[in-house]
């Protein structure tokens, strides 16, 4: 359970994360399991430990073996094992099974291929992508952040995709490659311009001062898996996180797929302890996808609490 397989190619960078997580961790010590010898933390070494990470810069076939990490905290020390295998570079184009990361599936509407393990590295865009050793060219292929997007996916797009990037450590550059299979599944889905179900455009929401209030932004984006779709709230044209009012927070609701197959998203805006100044703000529910952006505006108005005296007098 606390052991993890990692692999890489000789003369490439390989970075491995300790399979045990601290909850929390104060320090992490790494050892060669066979000799119990401590792995140095000084970056001048080719193999060195850096907190949760073990870095081979670059890796050599002789580095293959089991490495022990001990995550230390005042309460518990947790031990994990990284089983590392470094392979010689293949002279031909075939990528053997043992170098392959998990297979991903895509469809006409959702064709993201993530570059495996890239989040462990200090890399800068763009990534280079290859299919069966051929560099991908043409407008159908878009390298975006840490993934590849293929437009208008066809069954012929199935195959082995390799990402290549440069890891930078203290000014030195190291190459990294990672390969995974991509399969294409047929999906009768579609994407359309966002339709906001709630709130209604220019809706006035009644709230009570001092009480909590919730506003739900709900929108549908088409049928089936959506490649890029989001709903969010803005306050006076500013993102909630940037607005800086801790009483007002948004949290993702359920990803909904209705019986009719529509793919919808909810975002709930929670206002704690409603104040007078909240009534002056403009609340925008935004729904966006590849087709564009739709905005519905809501304003708050004061709800007068029922005066029980006047009812019973």
């Amino acid at each position: 359970k606390f052991s993890k397989q990692s692999w890489g190619l000789e003369n490439e960078a390989l970075i491995v994360r300790c399979p045990r997580q601290g909850k929390p961790s104060y320090t992490v010590d790494w050892y060669y399991s066979q000799t119990n010898k401590s792995i140095p933390t000084q970056e001048r070494n080719r193999v060195f430990a850096s907190g949760q990470l073990l870095k081979f810069l670059p890796a050599a076939v002789a580095d293959s073996g089991i490495y022990t990490c001990i995550v230390r905290s005042p309460t518990f020390n947790r031990t994990g094992y990284a089983n590392v295998t470094i392979y010689k570079k293949q002279s031909d184009c075939n990528v053997p099974d043992y170098l392959m990361y998990s297979t991903v599936s895509g469809s006409e509407k959702n064709s993201k291929i993530y570059c495996p393990t890239i989040d462990l590295y200090n890399w800068t865009a763009p990534l280079e992508w290859f299919k069966n050793c051929q560099a991908l060219q043409g407008s159908r292929y878009r390298a975006h952040k840490s993934f590849l997007v293929i437009d208008n996916v066809m069954t012929e797009d199935a195959g082995d995709y390799t990402c290549k990037f440069i890891h930078n450590e203290n000014g030195a550059n190291y190459s990294v490659t990672a390969t995974r299979s991509f399969t294409v599944k047929d999906e009768q889905g579609f994407s359309l311009f966002p339709v906001i179900g709630a709130p209604a455009q220019n809706e006035i929401k009644e709230v009570e001062i001092g009480k909590n209030a919730n506003l739900t932004c709900s929108a549908c984006f088409g049928k089936g898996t959506q490649f890029l779709a989001a709903v969010l709230w803005q306050l006076n044209g500013t993102k909630i996180t940037d607005f800086g009012e801790p009483r007002i927070q948004q949290e993702e609701g359920q990803n909904q797929s209705f019986s009719n197959g529509l793919a919808c998203l909810d975002m709930v805006l929670r206002i704690a302890d409603v104040k007078e100044e909240d009534l002056l703000l403009q609340y925008d529910c935004l729904a966006l996808n590849l087709h564009g952006l739709r905005r519905h505006t809501v304003r708050l108005s004061r709800k007068n609490p029922i005066d029980h005296h006047s009812i019973y007098c």
């Epitope: 909850k23 929390p24 104060y26 320090t27 005042p74 518990f76």
Partner: antibody, heavy 118, light 112 residues
Framework: QVQLQQSGAEVVRPGASVTLSCKAS????????MHWVKQTPVHGLEWIGA????????AYSQNFKGKATLTADESSSTAYMELSSLTSEDSAVYYC???????????WGQGTTLTVSS | DIVMTQAAISNPVTLGTSASMSCRSS???????????LYWYLQKPGHSPQLLIY???NLASGVPDRFSSSGSGTDFTLKISRVEAEDVGVYYC?????????FGSGTKLEIK
């Protein structure tokens, strides 16, 4: 919103034992340590011990070894603390509190009041 | 055990003004990893303690930036820049450097 729901107040006789519970919701109980803290007007906040629900490993304050026993049940997402050989000194409010990725005592239960009285 | 020392009551403060309280540890809370394991909690009347500050100077999620904390390895100060009525309660410092974790006796914030 992480929630720790503790069991209700208890009134027990001296010499008896009691088990307090703490139910975790909105996170996986095995992902973080669970700690227990005692609060009295005289001694203030005192750390009792902690459990790693993933492995069942426990750590105790010397002052509570033999007094408190910590367990956790992954299937019900609940942590338990058994207090034995109770005396009036054990009358207190007991809190469960979970750790986070970077620190301890990130969120707390509402507390359970234990009264030991004959 | 590491002893955490706090003054029982802070000087009464006026709403909107600043308040500060101190905490001292019997041993340096600076770990070899460079982190100082000093924490501040607020316990409002009738409530559980809530985390305000972790690792000496980091604001916990949802805590207003009116709160700040500073210190050395053994002497620490919590400052509230503009005191609000909701800040009333007992403030505890605590150390998480080593077992057993220990708490200060608490400082009660009172409003004039």
């Amino acid at each position: 919103q992480v929630q720790l729901q503790q069991s209700g107040a208890e009134v027990v006789r001296p010499g008896a034992s009691v088990t307090l519970s703490c139910k975790a919701s909105d996170y996986t109980i095995t992902d973080y340590e669970m700690h227990w803290v005692k609060q009295t007007p005289v001694h203030g906040l005192e750390w009792i011990g902690a459990i790693d629900p993933e492995t069942g490993d426990t750590a105790y304050s010397q002052n509570f070894k033999g007094k408190a026993t910590l367990t956790a049940d992954e299937s019900s997402s609940t942590a338990y603390m058994e207090l034995s050989s109770l005396t009036s000194e054990d009358s207190a409010v007991y809190y469960c509190s979970r750790s986070a990725t970077d620190y301890y005592f990130a969120s707390w239960g509402q507390g359970t009041t234990l009264t030991v009285s004959s | 055990d590491i002893v955490m020392t706090q003054a029982a009551i802070s000087n009464p403060v006026t709403l909107g003004t600043s308040a500060s309280m101190s905490c001292r540890s019997s041993k340096s809370l600076l770990h070899s990893n460079g982190i100082t394991y000093l924490y501040w909690y607020l316990q409002k009347p009738g409530h559980s303690p809530q985390l305000l500050i972790y690792q000496m100077s980091n604001l916990a999620s949802g805590v207003p930036d009116r709160f700040s904390s500073s210190g050395s390895g053994t002497d620490f100060t919590l400052k509230i820049s503009r005191v609000e009525a909701e800040d009333v309660g007992v403030y505890y410092c605590a150390q998480n450097l080593e077992l057993p974790f220990t708490f200060g006796s608490g400082t009660k914030l009172e409003i004039k």
